[in-house]
């Protein structure tokens, strides 16, 4: 008789999840000399311990502390790029501008990027059938709590000028319910962070509006100002040209507004 299994609304754990995490860890530690001391088998042990045998709607930040400890990494605090709803461009940017870092350029972010995982209460099995959806099931699920934990730590580490890339094509350019809006904004440390600079990325080629005047950006400015952090905003009208100019800043066409 098959054992009854909880059906969640979200997709199940990414196939070959342990192997993927281990393989990513090995690759990352080979590429980043400062993380060569990391034992990837211990990293996986800490990862599995955070969610396996636990109810997938009852995960806490505390569950991830052993993993956080093993993945402790120092990135230049003044070279942090946050993003919201525009991950691909943010990653393309840091692949070119190698001295800047998104969360996914750190070990822990790299391990979990685009993956889903959950376990089942009181069994040592990974649930490959379904996992809780943040909206339909519960917010304290393994994936959401992981990203909340690493995002908070990443924001807390930031200093000087912090950049954030925002998607100008969305109805809410700044969304209070995004990870950036609900976690990172509130964990920037005013005693360390001088300015948050938003880069609003335009979608349409002929879009010449000043999206820095958007009501949601004004809301972001208000939140940031109340936290005693300065705010600035730039329109990136041509993201393709923007990336090209990051690659080749000497190009003559890069003196004009992008």
């Amino acid at each position: 008789v098959p054992r009854w299994r909880q059906q969640w609304s979200g997709p199940g754990t990414t196939k070959r999840f342990p192997e993927t995490v281990l393989a990513r860890c090995v690759k990352y530690t080979e590429i980043h000399p400062e993380m060569r001391h990391v034992d990837c088998q211990s990293v996986w042990d800490a990862f599995k311990g955070a969610f396996i045998s636990k109810h997938p709607c009852n995960i806490t930040e505390e569950d991830y502390q052993p993993l956080m400890k093993l993945g402790t990494q120092t990135v230049p605090c003044n070279k942090i790029l946050l993003w919201s709803r525009i991950k691909d461009l943010a990653h393309q940017f840091t692949q070119v501008q190698r001295d800047m870092f998104t969360l996914e350029d750190t070990l822990l972010g790299y391990l979990a990027d685009d993956l889903t995982w959950c376990g089942e209460f009181n069994t040592s099995k990974i649930n490959y059938q379904s996992c809780p959806d943040w909206r339909k099931d519960c917010s304290n699920n393994p994936v959401s709590v992981f990203w909340k934990t690493v995002s908070r730590r990443f924001a807390e580490a930031a200093c000087d000028v912090v950049h954030v890339m925002l998607n100008g094509s969305r109805s809410k350019i700044f969304d209070k319910n995004s990870t950036f809006g609900s976690v990172e904004v509130h964990n920037l440390q005013p005693e360390k962070v001088q300015t948050l600079e938003a880069w609003v990325i335009h979608g349409g080629r002929e879009d010449s509006r000043d999206l820095c005047q958007d009501p949601t950006i004004k809301e972001l400015e208000s939140i940031i100002s109340k936290r005693n952090i300065q705010f600035s905003c730039k329109n990136i009208y041509r993201p393709d040209k923007f990336l090209q100019c990051v690659k080749n800043p000497e190009d003559s066409s890069c003196t004009s507004e992008i």
């Epitope: 281990l22 393989a23 088998q41 211990s42 042990d45 396996i52 052993p66 040592s124 990974i126």
Partner: antibody, heavy 120, light 107 residues
């Protein structure tokens, strides 16, 4: 039927090295990890280290670091344990044992053991 | 390293007896605990994993319980073939560590 077959007994001089092999059959070699566990005469079990063949990575107990090298050859489905600078207290039966890569379960299959005697 | 402490180190019992062996971890290991049986001159054999799950093919008289730091292996009715040494082992973190063993002898 899964089988782990280890190499034969060895007698070694202090200061020398020994390499013990563990050939797996009856399962997908690259889907598992292999640990080495030793047992000195009349003593308990002591974990030495573990290799994941599909990634080619290994770790080991601090006690053995610098002396033990654990490797695997996917082409022959064989795991190896190389212990150097042997001393008399390394006299033991050495076992290889299999678990899943995700380490969610126990060592479900064990080799028959290899007696290594270190004596001058 | 996580220390695993078994008690008793040996015990004498008769066929049909209920036998209980305990294992204590020096820090919390959730349910990442296995129990093994070893007979003289043989390799260990897995009995229990995840603290309470019975390994395939193992008789139901063997059971495990506990989580965190305190664990128990119970043999409900000791059989002649159960006289052996039993080890607990944690697989919560590296290095993997075993208890020192409990020898079950015939009274």
């Amino acid at each position: 039927q899964v089988q782990l077959v280890q190499s034969g007994a060895e007698v070694k001089k202090p200061g020398s090295s020994v390499k013990v092999s563990c050939k797996a059959s009856g399962g997908t070699f690259s889907s598992y990890a292999f640990s080495w566990v030793r047992q000195a005469p009349g003593q308990g079990l002591e974990w030495m280290g573990r290799v994941i063949p599909f990634l080619g990575i290994a770790n080991s107990a601090q006690k053995f670091q610098g002396r033990v090298t654990i490797t695997a050859d996917k082409s022959t489905s064989t795991a190896y344990m190389d212990l150097s600078s042997l001393r008399s207290e390394d006299t033991a039966v050495y076992y290889c044992a299999r678990d899943d890569i995700a380490a969610l379960g126990p060592f479900d299959y064990w080799g028959q053991g290899t007696l290594v005697t270190v004596s001058s | 390293d996580i220390q695993m402490t078994q008690s008793p180190s040996s015990l004498s019992a008769s066929v049909g007896d209920r036998v209980t062996i305990t294992c204590r971890a020096s820090q919390g290991i959730s349910s990442w605990l296995a129990w093994y049986q070893q007979k003289p001159e043989k390799a260990p054999k897995s009995l229990i994993y995840a603290a309470s799950s019975l390994q395939s093919g193992v008789p139901s008289r063997f059971s495990g319980s506990g989580s965190g730091t305190d664990f128990t292996l119970t043999i409900s009715s000791l059989q002649p073939e159960d006289f052996a040494t039993y080890y607990c082992q944690q697989y919560n973190s590296y290095p993997r560590t075993f208890g020192q063993g409990t020898k079950v002898e015939i009274k």
